[in-house]
């Protein structure tokens, strides 16, 4: 197979014919050294998936349900290119499956038993697979056959295409369960009409259905969406209140050696030459031979799927949960309203050991999952492999953009017993220099910098945000002569000062000696000119408070703070000499797990929090000899957030604005994936 050939998998004679036409037309517009198309014909999409996994083909376009099959072992395929719909300016690559109800009804998602339901059709994504998959474990046993369990769960339904003889309740609201538009309650508009007419109490449809059927906002205001957290939202808040986000149609490839760049190059060229309204002789998004061949006829173009986005992230936790429930038919033994153990995400082996110790002391109420970077941990929480972790504000922002919510805040200044209910204002992000140097905020260019990690608040977002507004470009590695900013590109000058050891050099975890607050300060002590840290870092690591060899003889008076007005002050005066106020670190979780995480952590801190005095012979949650493992060591307690329960409210408008501005300089692959 030529190096630059993309073997496209076709699943019918008509598709194979279109594929050959695609191949020939691409040959005529691409240079001879450019990508080319080869066609492979298989009997079904599942056969195509297997062929790609076996390296007999390279690409195929799939619906969401098949993307799930493609991702499962042993196939291990991943999404590489998405079809988009709508306009180029506002491309839609996903739709949202929603549960619509009338505003004057008073039930929530967990109160659907005994209600009347309207569905688009049996086996369809938004109308059946997703809602029934998510409700699966609430269905009465036996859950097989599924139609019977659903019929016994709702008091009456319209499920077009269901068997009305075997399951009459499923056709109670639409006699015969007609499988075409002859049934007035068929498909999206039909299911909505079923609700609108008062036949049903809830309609399972797409987010766009309401807008397509009710042009008038006043009419739409008579309806609401049911959210998975048992609240309701208005119909235009579907992004924050849906059953699942469903990818429309996606090109998949192998996860390893999958030619994704080549596939993108090919499809990008293809849409330029043969996309919507581009060419008379060949159209990518239509065909004289049939409907939706190779690509959907309704597609307007392609978007490259960000490289960090694997199939789990692409399909989303809710969608995977729903499909897995339906396919595997397994439910937890515990009732769903009971809290299962919370899986904490630990960064590399130091945190994992502390987490294991916590797990033992919690009698298994805490379990541990590991990842090598904070972003990998956030991704694990998103997809359900982990449940929670405590994050610096910069990562609370990324986690929030990825759909996670803050649950509890670390408090550093409030003494018990008021701590748990106090909302602290935050800590100060400061720039620390040696007293012996002549540095000021205005002459940092060309100096050696030490950062906690890329993307963190005090170590990166605040100082680099201020710097950006001064220099108006993102080339921070050119501004400083060298530095250590864990998480930077390995060949960057901002990895040059890092200490490693070798394979972990510049990694954003505790294996890198200059990682985190203590690490950045150590970098200043040993190699750097300026360290960007929290205001407590110097006092916590001087005067013998840190027994490590590099720190045990350090004196607080040998360090000073840089003020934004060009002056310097003692490290005792952060309130009058700081870069900005930073939001405290906070625990984040998925929305569905937030209540359990909060309840469990409040209980755990009562046992292992700052009330424990002897940490040498007892487990202490907020202690790790200045290494800030799992939580900052200066945490007094984890505090309730009250109404600051979204990332925007928690971080505050000013900080969110600052980080959003800095996104032009973002090196976060996860953020790119979550904003796709």
């Amino acid at each position: 197979v030529p190096e630059k050939s993309v073997r496209w998998c076709a699943v019918s004679e008509h598709e194979a014919t279109k594929c050959q036409s695609f191949r020939d037309h691409m040959k005529s517009v691409l240079p001879s050294n450019g990508p080319s198309v080869a066609c492979v014909k298989k009997a079904s999409h599942l056969d195509c998936i297997r062929a790609i996994a076996a390296n007999e083909a390279d690409a195929v376009t799939l619906d969401a349900g098949l993307v799930y099959d493609a991702y499962l072992a042993p196939n291990n395929l991943k999404p590489v290119v998405a079809e988009f719909y709508g306009s180029k300016e506002d491309p839609q690559t996903f739709y949202y499956a929603v549960a619509v109800v009338k505003k004057d009804s008073d039930f929530q998602m967990n109160q659907l038993r005994g209600r009347k339901s309207c569905h688009t059709g049996l086996g369809r994504s938004a109308g059946w697979n997703i809602p029934i998959g998510l409700l699966y474990c609430d269905l009465p046993e036996p859950r097989k056959p599924l139609e019977k369990a659903v019929a016994n769960f709702f008091s009456g339904s319209c499920v077009p295409c269901a068997d009305g003889t075997d399951f009459p309740q499923l056709c109670q609201l639409c006699p015969g369960c007609g499988c075409s538009t002859l049934n007035q309650y068929f498909s999206y508009s039909g299911a909505f009409k079923c609700l609108k007419d008062g036949a049903g109490d809830v309609a399972f449809v797409k987010h766009s259905t309401i807008f397509e059927n009710l042009a008038n906002k006043a009419d739409r205001d008579q309806y609401e969406l049911l959210c998975l957290d048992n609240t309701r939202k208005s119909v235009d808040e579907y992004k924050d209140c849906h059953l699942a986000r469903v990818p429309s149609h996606t090109v998949v490839a192998r996860s390893v050696g999958g030619k994704e760049d080549l596939i993108w190059e090919l499809l990008n060229q293809a849409q330029e030459h043969f996309g919507k309204d581009k060419s008379k002789e060949f159209q990518l998004f239509s065909s004289p031979h049939g409907k939706d061949l190779l690509f959907k006829d309704s597609a307007h173009g392609f978007l490259k799927v960000p490289p960090r986005m694997d199939a789990k992230m692409y399909l989303g936790y809710e969608y995977i949960t729903a499909i897995r429930n339906l396919r595997e038919g397994t439910c937890p033994e515990a009732p769903t309203d009971e809290c299962k153990p919370v899986k904490w995400c630990a960064l590399s082996h130091h945190e994992r050991l502390k987490c294991d110790e916590w797990s033992v002391n919690s009698a298994g109420k805490i379990e541990c999952e590991s990842a090598e970077t904070t972003e990998d941990c956030i991704a694990k929480i998103m997809n359900g492999e982990a449940d929670a972790m405590s994050l610096d504000g910069g990562f609370v922002y990324i986690a929030g953009m990825c759909g996670l919510v803050p649950v509890l805040a670390e408090n550093y200044n409030t003494p018990n017993p008021n701590c748990e209910n106090t909302a602290e204002e935050g800590y100060f992000a400061v720039a620390v220099v040696k007293s012996s140097s002549d540095l000021t905020w205005d002459n940092l260019k060309g100096k050696k910098s030490c950062h906690t990690a890329v993307g963190r608040t005090a170590g990166w977002n605040i100082p680099m945000g201020l710097l950006y507004s001064k220099i108006n470009h993102c080339r921070f590695d050119e501004f400083f002569s060298e530095g250590c900013a864990p998480g930077s590109e390995k060949n960057s000058s901002l990895c040059k000062l890092c200490m490693g050891p070798s394979p972990n050099l510049c990694e954003p975890n505790n294996k890198e000696g200059y990682y985190g607050y203590t690490g950045a300060f150590r970098c200043l002590v040993e190699k750097g000119d300026v360290a960007f840290v929290k205001h407590q870092t110097v006092p916590q690591n001087t005067g013998g408070k840190n027994p490590d060899a590099w720190a045990k003889n350090l004196k607080e008076e040998d360090y000073e703070l840089l003020c934004l007005d060009g002056s310097r002050k003692s490290v005792q005066e952060p309130a009058n000499c700081h870069l900005a106020r930073a939001p405290n670190h906070a625990v984040v979780a998925r929305k569905d797990k937030a209540d359990c995480v909060q309840t469990l952590l409040l209980d755990q801190q009562r046992m292992f929090g700052s009330s424990v005095t002897d940490c040498s012979s007892n487990f202490c949650l907020f202690e790790s000899k200045t290494k800030d493992l799992l939580f900052r060591d200066d945490t007094v307690c984890l505090a309730k957030l009250h109404d600051r329960n979204t990332y925007e409210k928690y971080l505050g408008e000013e900080y969110v604005k600052a980080v959003t501005n800095l996104r032009k300089c973002s090196t976060s692959p996860l953020l790119e994936a979550c904003t796709f």
Epitope: L353, K354, V360, S617
Partner: nanobody, 117 residues
Framework: QVQLVESGGGLVQPGGSLRLSCAAS????????MAWYRQAPGKQRELVAG???????NYRDSVKGRFTISRDNAKNTMYLQMNSLKPEDTAVYYC???????????WGQGTQVTVSS
């Protein structure tokens, strides 16, 4: 820092039993938490069982009901009684006291357990 030495491993048939010991060179009385880990070839080291100073225990799901962890503070020793052994229990077993957890990635030699017919 307390030095720990593991012993008691060996070759055993599926369904058989072994008792591992972990002897400490100093007093373990004041150590908050002790644990057994294991590492199979090509796999990550994983927590098998742990015991707190007060004697409460915790086990990974796959060994619950088969393994029992205990500690004898007077003898400065921790034990792992392993019954109904399975081939998937084959690994090198290590004990740790967590006391030096934040400074060193220190592990002893471990003791090899092989379950095979």
């Amino acid at each position: 820092q307390v030095q720990l030495v593991e012993s008691g491993g060996g070759l055993v048939q599926p369904g058989g039993s072994l008792r591992l010991s972990c002897a400490a060179s100093g007093s373990i009385f004041s150590i908050a938490t002790m644990a057994w880990y294991r590492q199979a070839p090509g796999k990550q080291r994983e927590l098998v069982a742990g015991i707190t100073r007060s004697g409460s225990t915790n086990y990974r799901d796959s060994v619950k009901g088969r393994f029992t962890i205990s500690r004898d503070n007077a003898k400065n020793t921790m034990y792992l009684q392993m019954n109904s052994l399975k081939p998937e229990d084959t690994a090198v077993y290590y004990c740790t006291d967590y006391s030096s957890r934040y400074y060193h990635d220190y592990w002893g030699q471990g003791t090899q357990v092989t379950v095979s017919s």
